[in-house]
C-alpha cells in the first residue's frame, strides 16, 4: 500500500487515504501510450498516447508525456477545474536516434515504437544518441563543444596529414611488399609533402595515401639527411588542403602543441602536450643535426606520427615529429628549419648547387647535465652514475656507431683520451678525427669502443 505522501500531488477529488492495489482494475497487456499512474497515483493505468486528449475524464498521459492545454500551459488541477481538455505532448522535443537506425522526432515517439516492437516480439528500440542518426549532437552550449580546442585543431589540420608507405620488390617474384611507413603533411596545393628523411629513401617506391583514401605514387624531390627532412611530390588534379608553417622561433615553453600522424590508412593518431624547451641544441641531440635546434615536447612522438606535423593551437606547423628519447621526452624539427630547407630546396632545384660532405657516425645524443641525469635515473633505475658526458638517445641502424657497438642509453665520457663533457665535444671531435676511440659508460661499467666516422652528403 502507498501512503498519501507517496503519491503525486495535487490529489484529485475522491482519492482514498490509502492506496489499495487490490482494488486497481486489470490492465491490458499492451498500452499504446505506455503506462501511467491514475489521478490518485494509486493504480497503474494505460496512459494516453502522444496527441491524445488528456485532463477532464480522459485520464493521464503516458510515460514522458505531459498534458498541455491548447495555449501551451501544462494541465493541472486548475485546468481540470476550468473543465478544459488538454493534449498529451512529449516533454522532450529534440530528435533522437534509435537502435533500429531510425531518427525519431522525440523520445516519446521512440518509446512508442519500442512498445510496438515488443508487442511483435521484436527487440525493444533504445536510444543510441541525442540528435538524428548519422549526425553528431551539436550543442553549442555543451562543455565539450566549448572546450575541445584540441579536437578543433585536429579537425582543421587532419585533411592535410598523409600516410606514407615504402615498398620494395622481392628479388624473384617481383611482388611488392611494404617495408616502412610514416606520416607527412602537405605544404603546397599542387602536392608537395614534407616528411622525415628517414621515412623515405630513393630506391623504394613511395606511396602516399590521403585522408580521403586516395593513393598516389610519390617522387622524392629533395632530401636533407642531416636535418632529417625530405620533400616528396604527388601529382594530383585539383587543389589539396595544405598546412601553413608557423614561426618556431616564437614558441614559448608551456605552449600547447598537438602531434598528429597517419600511421594507418584512413586513420590519424593524435597526441598532445606542451613545449618543454624551444631551443634544445641540435649538437646535443644528433650529429646529423649538429647545426640545428630542436623543440622538446612531452607530446608522445612515435613511429605512428613520425614525419607528421607538430602544430600549435592555430593549426600552424611548428615542427616535424621526429624522435622519442624516453617517456615524456620527444623532439621535433623546428618549422624555421623546414622553411630554410624548402627555400634551399627551391634554390637547389633551380640552380643545381653542389653540396659539401659532412662526417657522420649515426647517433642522436644530448648533453648530460646533473639535472638531466637525475631525470633519467628516476626513469631508468640502471642509468649510469654520471653527471656529465654525451647521452646516446638513439643509434641509427647500419651506421658507424652501430658497427662500433654503441648502444642506446650509453654515455660517452671520453674520446681519444679527451674527456667529454657535452654533446658538442663529440661533434667537434668528429669533425677533426678519422678514428674515435671512445670510453663509454654502460650501466656501471666502462667500455672501449672504436667508431670510424663516414662522410655523407648533408
Amino acid at each position: 500500500q502507498l501512503s498519501r505522501a507517496g503519491r503525486s500531488a495535487p490529489l484529485a477529488a475522491g482519492c482514498p487515504d490509502r492506496c489499495e492495489p487490490a482494488r486497481c482494475p486489470p490492465q491490458p497487456e499492451h498500452c499504446e501510450g505506455g503506462r501511467a499512474r491514475d489521478a490518485c497515483g494509486c493504480c497503474e493505468v494505460c496512459g494516453a498516447p502522444e496527441g491524445a486528449a488528456c485532463g477532464l475524464q480522459e485520464g493521464p498521459c503516458g510515460e514522458g508525456l505531459q498534458c498541455v492545454v491548447p495555449f501551451g500551459v501544462p494541465a493541472s488541477a486548475t485546468v481540470r477545474r476550468r473543465a478544459q481538455a488538454g493534449l498529451c505532448v512529449c516533454a522532450s522535443s529534440e530528435p533522437v536516434c534509435g537502435s533500429d537506425a531510425n531518427t525519431y522526432a522525440n523520445l516519446c515517439q521512440l518509446r512508442a515504437a519500442s512498445r510496438r516492437s515488443e508487442r511483435l516480439h521484436r527487440p525493444p528500440v533504445i536510444v543510441l544518441q541525442r540528435g538524428a542518426c548519422g549526425q553528431g549532437q551539436e550543442d553549442p552550449n555543451s562543455l565539450r563543444h566549448k572546450y575541445n580546442f584540441i579536437a578543433d585543431v585536429v579537425e582543421k589540420i587532419a585533411p592535410a596529414v598523409v600516410h606514407i608507405e615504402l615498398f620494395r620488390k622481392l628479388p624473384f617474384s617481383k611482388r611488392e611488399v611494404p617495408v616502412a611507413s610514416g606520416s607527412g603533411f602537405i605544404v603546397s596545393e599542387d602536392g608537395l609533402i614534407v616528411t622525415n628523411a628517414h621515412v623515405v629513401t630513393n630506391k623504394h617506391r613511395v606511396k602516399v595515401e590521403l585522408k580521403n583514401g586516395a593513393t598516389y605514387e610519390a617522387k622524392i624531390k629533395d632530401v636533407d639527411e642531416k636535418a632529417d627532412i625530405a620533400l616528396i611530390k604527388i601529382d594530383h588534379q585539383g587543389k589539396l588542403p595544405v598546412l601553413l608553417l608557423g614561426r618556431s622561433s616564437e614558441l614559448r615553453p608551456g605552449e600547447f602543441v598537438v602531434a598528429i600522424g597517419s600511421p594507418f590508412s584512413l586513420q590519424n593518431t593524435v597526441t598532445t602536450g606542451i613545449v618543454s624547451t624551444t631551443q634544445r641544441g641540435g649538437k646535443e641531440l644528433g650529429l646529423r643535426n649538429s647545426d640545428m635546434d630542436y623543440i622538446q615536447t612531452d607530446a608522445i612522438i612515435n613511429y605512428g606520427n613520425s614525419g607528421g606535423p607538430l602544430v600549435n593551437l592555430d593549426g600552424e606547423v611548428i615542427g616535424i615529429n621526429t624522435l622519442k628519447v624516453t617517456a615524456g621526452i620527444s623532439f621535433a624539427i623546428p618549422s624555421d628549419k623546414i622553411k630554410k630547407f624548402l627555400t634551399e630546396s627551391h634554390d637547389r632545384q633551380a640552380k643545381g648547387k653542389a653540396i659539401t660532405k659532412k662526417k657522420y657516425i649515426g647517433i642522436r645524443m644530448m648533453s648530460l647535465t646533473s639535472s638531466k641525469a637525475k631525470e633519467l635515473k628516476d626513469r631508468h633505475r640502471d642509468f649510469p652514475d654520471v653527471i656529465s658526458g654525451a647521452y646516446i638517445i638513439e643509434v641509427i641502424p647500419d651506421t658507424p656507431a652501430e658497427a662500433g657497438g654503441l648502444k642506446e642509453n650509453d654515455v660517452i665520457i671520453s674520446i681519444n683520451g679527451q674527456s667529454v663533457v657535452s654533446a658538442n665535444d663529440v661533434s667537434d671531435v668528429i669533425k677533426r678525427e678519422s678514428t674515435l676511440n671512445m670510453v663509454v659508460r654502460r650501466g656501471n661499467e666502462d667500455i672501449m669502443i672504436t667508431v670510424i666516422p663516414e662522410e655523407i652528403d648533408p
Epitope: L170, P171, F172, S173, R175, V179, H204, D398
Partner: antibody, heavy 123, light 105 residues
C-alpha cells in the same frame, strides 16, 4: 628476433625422396622470399632456389630443376624443400636462408640462416 | 652464370695483423656480399652492398671494390676471426665464391 628452425638430420636410401622443413619466426613470413642453399666440401655453397611464401611462386637454379621442389605453408610459417631420386651426390648440408635487402636500396643478400640439415644418402 | 674466384684459398695471420682477401668476378657486378662461417655453424652475413657492415659486426672488418674486383679486410686479426670467408654476388641469381680459410698463427 628472427629465427629459422630446420628439421633434423636425415639418413635415406638412394632413389628415395626426402622433405626438409624450415620454420620461420620473428618476422612476417610472407614479406620475404625463402631461399635454400646446398653446401658440400667439393662444391662449396650453391644456391638451389627460392619461394615467395605469399604466392607460392618459385625460382630455381637450372642445376636443381627436377631435383628440388619448394613449397611453403603460410599458416605455420614453414618452408619446405623436397628432394627426389636421391643419390650420394645429394649428401650435403642444406640451409634455408631468408632474403635480405638494403633499406638504402643496394642489392639482395641472405641475412638470416637456419642451423642447417645434414642429409646423408647411403645404402 | 657469374663465377666468383676467391684468393687465397687458405691463409694464416697472427693476432693484430692486417688481413686482406680478394674476390674476383667473371663479369662486372654492382655489389658484393661477404659471409663468415665457423666449423659446425651456419654462414653469417658480415658485409652487404660491398662496404656496409652488417649489424653486430666489429668495425675491424671492412669491404671495398667495384666491377670485377672486391676485397675483405680485417684491420687487426683476432683469434675469433679464424673461419672460412665467402663472397657472394646477386645479379640474375646468387652465386658464391669457393671460400678463403683464415687460420690463426
Amino acid at each position: 628476433q628472427v629465427q629459422l628452425q630446420q628439421s633434423g638430420a636425415e639418413l635415406v636410401r638412394p632413389g628415395a625422396s626426402v622433405k626438409l622443413s624450415c620454420k620461420a619466426s620473428g618476422y612476417t613470413f610472407t614479406d620475404y622470399e625463402m631461399h635454400w642453399v646446398k653446401q658440400t666440401p667439393v662444391h662449396g655453397l650453391e644456391w638451389i632456389g627460392a619461394i615467395d611464401p605469399e604466392t607460392g611462386g618459385t625460382a630455381y637454379n637450372q642445376k636443381f630443376k627436377g631435383k628440388a621442389t619448394l613449397t611453403a605453408d603460410k599458416s605455420s610459417s614453414t618452408a619446405y624443400m623436397e628432394l627426389r631420386s636421391l643419390t650420394s651426390e645429394d649428401s650435403a648440408v642444406y640451409y634455408c636462408t631468408r632474403e635480405g635487402y638494403s633499406y638504402d636500396g643496394g642489392g639482395y643478400y641472405f641475412d638470416y640462416w637456419g642451423q642447417g640439415t645434414t642429409l646423408t644418402v647411403s645404402s | 652464370q657469374i663465377v666468383l674466384t676467391q684468393s687465397p684459398a687458405i691463409m694464416s695471420a697472427s693476432p693484430g695483423e692486417k688481413v686482406t682477401m680478394t674476390c674476383s668476378v667473371s663479369s662486372s657486378v654492382s655489389y658484393m656480399y661477404w659471409y663468415q662461417q665457423k666449423p659446425g655453424s651456419s654462414p653469417r652475413l658480415l658485409i652487404y652492398d660491398t662496404s656496409n657492415l652488417a649489424s653486430g659486426v666489429p668495425v675491424r672488418f671492412s669491404g671495398s671494390g667495384s666491377g670485377t674486383s672486391y676485397s675483405l679486410t680485417i684491420s687487426r686479426m683476432e683469434a675469433e676471426d679464424a673461419a672460412t670467408y665467402y663472397c657472394q654476388q646477386w645479379s640474375s641469381y646468387p652465386t658464391f665464391g669457393g671460400g678463403t680459410k683464415l687460420e690463426i698463427k
